[in-house]
Amino acid sequence: TGADTEAVVCVGTACYTAHSGKLSAAEAQNHCNQNGGNLATVKSKEEAQHVQRVLAQLLRREAALTARMSKFWIGLQREKGKCLDPSLPLKGFSWVGGGEDTPYSNWHKELRNSCISKRCVSLLLDLSQPLLPSRLPKWSEGPCGSPGSPGSNIEGFVCKFSFKGMCRPLALGGPGQVTYTTPFQTTSSSLEAVPFASAANVACGEGDKDETQSHYFLCKEKAPDVFDWGSSGPLCVSPKYGCNFNNGGCHQDCFEGGDGSFLCGCRPGFRLLDDLVTCASRNPCSSSPCRGGATCVLGPHGKNYTCRCPQGYQLDSSQLDCVDVDECQDSPCAQECVNTPGGFRCECWVGYEPGGPGEGACQDVDECALGRSPCAQGCTNTDGSFHCSCEEGYVLAGEDGTQCQDVDECVGPGGPLCDSLCFNTQGSFHCGCLPGWVLAPNGVSCTMGPVSLGPPSGPPDEEDKGEKEGSTVPRAATASPTRGPEGTPKATPTTSRPSLSSDAPITSAPLKMLAPSGSPGVWREPSIHHATAASGPQEPAGGDSSVATQNNDGTDGQK
């Protein structure tokens, strides 16, 4: 019940092997790992097709799979203690060999939301249907099986082995047999690409022991990203066949000499490589060696090439790939610089806006300008900020320090202001006297006056009306007598003196802020300007990127 029959497909820089045998996911991963691989990833539709091909190869050889549905482990797992995450394409699962999550997925059905047990993914094959590229195997999630109890395990698994490069298959110019042995211990006589470090055994002849000659080759890295066998000329050539056997093993043209010998040649625009078999384009750019948006530029006489990057990008150490230039390293902005792919943009601190001499310059925002002042009364602009002040008789108030509130001088902590009665008004106060007393010229003391039964003298009339316009806390005038020890009205309430300084308490905001400011509590977005190269002007991302999308499929997260 180990891993039995296997099939292999090599493409790009990876080989996929398919195995039958009832193993748990852990045992299957261990089997792949022993040979230097992992359970396979399926990160794209193309990769899904490669995996499907290797499974089709396995199923052609494997008569034992009689079940209608068959499952094969791949390297997608969710650890114990990690809940399903429906907002992600991989639903909280991850590839066992590591690597980034990719958007491709092909789930068989809505997943069960579980958090407790480890969950593993297998490819679900319907063996009653032909395997078509348009009908790729679905992903099925379930328990990971138990080592040593085949009943709980599934039919097989797929491994993936990655390599730095591949050699072309060896071309035979006459009868013979090639056997490739890969670094992951698979032997095959038909690979469309042969992985780096594979060995090739070539037995020439038609089976006659006398005529058999053997050759041994190794797939080596001849130059960076160039892999070949180190062989020269077609193998197993025979004058008996000339160019008639497998085109003499030649990649393109085969030219016969009169003596049964032959040579390989290439079509116009191509040149023969050192193996004397393979043809490559004379234009080195035809193989698209440049990556990441780089353009391939032919060198003089079309012999070599260089890669060129678009504005805002530069070549990396391989000289083949483009990476973003961090223009902010050169401090091109007066205040804040934000690097963007292929460019950058300048931002101004809160309290500043784009403007002034030079690119990326910032100028102070005059928060106190007509029509935009956030202050209820006085406003003083400062560099990058502002502060509010209040008129006499008012103090700054409000959470953000932009409002003004009347000071009730009649109840302040400064002791008696009036000898008798005190009347608070908007921004001021007045003294008054009890019946039978009159206010002295100093406006504070009371002197005995003619007996009168009228109201207390001195309440304010309309003289203050509108004195403190802009105050957000209007108050009615109030008389505040204080009781004396015997219960009779005492001369005055305790009040505070009016402030004689109009700029007394002020609120200021720090100059440099990348957080909301202005006056505290007044939010302003950073100003943005000056974009270069690939990036146009953009607002900083608003809203909340972490808000997940609403899913209403009503499935309650079933398996």
Epitope: R112, S114, S117, D556, Q558
Partner: antibody, heavy 115, light 109 residues
Framework: QVQLQQSGAELVRPGASVKLSCKAS????????MHWVRQTPVHGLEWIGG????????AYNQKFKGKATLTADKSSSTAYMELRSLTSEDSAVYYC????????WGQGTLVTVSA | QAVVTQESALTTSPGETVTLTCRSS?????????ANWVQEKPDHLFTGLIG???NRAPGVPARFSGSLIGDKAALTITGAQTEDEAIYFC?????????FGGGTKLTVL
């Protein structure tokens, strides 16, 4: 429709054990985890633990390790929670709830621990 | 163990939109916390509303929605109805256990 039917109220002595049951119907029992939660006036809702009936895998709140044991019987579609070494602090209403999203709840079992 | 905090009480009017939040003492709530929202009506009747941050349970009206707002999980009732008066609990998953919040008593006047 989905139903979780819990066993009846229990009056138990301090130090004793009790086994509560939660019978599931209206869905495939092994398709969803079963979680257990208790409610008291002092601590509100407390998650005790959960079980995956398909694999028997469990997870527990550290506070209830050694106090609660969760099991599941696939043949009868019933989840069980055994509570041992009971004290007056364990007097509560105990609930089973289906799946890690707590979509469906049983009616609750009142457990009273009293001498 | 982590502490999960909810508003103790909120009041809304029929037809209004109200948002209940759920904060974690360990930092920002993310989708890996798999936030669940549960409604408790009188006589200990519990109903699951939202699971896994933003998935409505079967049969739950569309006016209930779950999301992440800033560093908290949120339950929004768009157009509250008098029958939505209840206690709402959130529960967050922390790698191997759930922790419930203290509940929010929602009054619909």
């Amino acid at each position: 429709q989905v139903q979780l039917q819990q066993s009846g109220a229990e009056l138990v002595r301090p130090g004793a054990s009790v086994k509560l049951s939660c019978k599931a119907s209206g869905y495939t029992f092994t398709d969803y985890e079963m979680h257990w939660v208790r409610q008291t006036p002092v601590h509100g809702l407390e998650w005790i633990g959960g079980i995956d009936p398909e694999t028997g895998g469990t997870a527990y709140n550290q506070k209830f390790k050694g106090k609660a044991t969760l099991t599941a019987d696939k043949s009868s579609s019933t989840a069980y929670m055994e509570l041992r070494s009971l004290t007056s602090e364990d007097s509560a209403v105990y609930y089973c709830t289906r799946g890690a999203w707590f979509a469906y709840w049983g009616q609750g079992t009142l457990v009273t621990v009293s001498a | 163990q982590a502490v999960v905090t909810q508003e103790s009480a909120l009041t809304t009017s029929p037809g209004e939109t109200v948002t209940l939040t759920c904060r974690s003492s360990t930092g920002a709530v993310t989708t890996s916390n798999s936030a669940n929202w549960v409604q408790e009506k009188p006589d200990h009747l519990f109903t699951g509303l939202i699971g896994g941050t933003n998935n409505r349970a079967p049969g739950v009206p569309a006016r209930f929605s779950g999301s992440l707002i800033g560093d908290k999980a949120a339950l929004t009732i768009t157009g509250a109805q008098t029958e939505d008066e209840a206690i709402y609990f959130c529960a967050l998953w922390y790698n191997n256990h759930f922790v419930f919040g203290g509940g929010t008593k929602l009054t619909v006047l």
